[in-house]
């Protein structure tokens, strides 16, 4: 089939001691091959400091996956979710303040 760019969605969930878990979800993309990783100040985190989801079919002939890491509250600006898919790339910031969801569709 033809290339379908991912919808990328970054969310935050509060955890204890001033730390938050940030999760980056990519969905509705084709083909299956994708790079999705957290960057701190533009540099990828080590693999062992991120949690990864499998790339799974989402039922529409496309795929979905996710990656998460833990950061200090107040340092959201330093972190971006980096996505590369079928020759396209993008960086997606962590929502700061009251906004806890950020969606972006790649074209």
């Amino acid at each position: 089939g033809s290339t379908v760019p991912p919808m990328v969605n970054v969310t935050c969930s509060e955890v204890s001691e001033g730390n938050i878990t940030v999760t980056c979800r990519a969905s509705s993309f084709y083909p299956r091959n994708i790079t999705l990783t957290w960057r701190q100040d533009g540099v990828s985190l080590s693999h062992n400091t991120q949690q990864w989801g499998d790339v799974l079919p989402d039922g529409n002939g496309t795929y979905q996956t996710w990656v998460a890491t833990r950061i200090r509250q107040g340092e959201e600006q330093r972190f971006t979710c980096y996505m590369e898919h079928s020759g396209n790339h993008g960086t997606h910031p962590v929502p700061s303040g009251n906004s806890h969801h950020h969606h972006h569709h790649h074209h």
């Epitope: 533009g42 540099v43 080590s46 790339h89 960086t91 910031p93």
Partner: antibody, heavy 118, light 112 residues
Framework: EIQLQQSGPELVKPGASVKVSCTAS????????IYWVKQSHGKSLEWIGY????????ISNQKFTGRATLTVDKSSSTAYLHLNSLTSEDSAVYYC???????????WGAGTTVTVSS | DILMTQTPLSLPVSLGDQASISCRSS???????????LEWYLQKPGQSPKLLIY???NRFSGVPDRFSGSGSGTDFTLKISRVEAEDLGVYYC?????????FGSGTKVEIK
Amino acid sequence: EIQLQQSGPELVKPGASVKVSCTASGYAFTKYNIYWVKQSHGKSLEWIGYIDPYTGGTISNQKFTGRATLTVDKSSSTAYLHLNSLTSEDSAVYYCARPGSYWYFGVWGAGTTVTVSS
Amino acid sequence: DILMTQTPLSLPVSLGDQASISCRSSQSIVYTNGNTNLEWYLQKPGQSPKLLIYKVSNRFSGVPDRFSGSGSGTDFTLKISRVEAEDLGVYYCFQASYVPFTFGSGTKVEIK
């Protein structure tokens, strides 16, 4: 080959401003941040800040807040460091640098010497 | 700001010697998620710095295996197993776990 080409030396008067450029080649400019580092003569290195060329987002060392402005021109794959209200303390070599997958300053420009003198 | 203290400031060596440089941070530079962004750079006179080691112990592409990095928390070490003439210059440690990023004051490795 990945390269960062910096603008030439600058001699400026106290109180004036200067704009240093850093033109990237050999890679997709919006894939990687551009960092700026200061080195005063015979001294250590000082991180100024960085810019994400994809989003335009910046993070800076508070020491330089209000005096250093980081911008990019995506069409020419060029990053700029704009320094204002210059004093003799700003006389230094200014480097731009680019990270890699897991490291910060993997590629450096050759540096731009800024001399502040009346 | 996190202060990066390097010792010694000057390290006179004979070619073929082992050299060891210490870098101590004023607080732990292990980030919340376990990431430790500690790097080592070498700057030769009139040149831009060059990356040697990233994330404490990983050698950058093209860096000879006589260079090794180790440490954790607040204490880090760069070792050169057999110093060669091309290794002379100023070595800097650098932390990017916390903003502002900070460099050590430098260690000059020179011939005895």
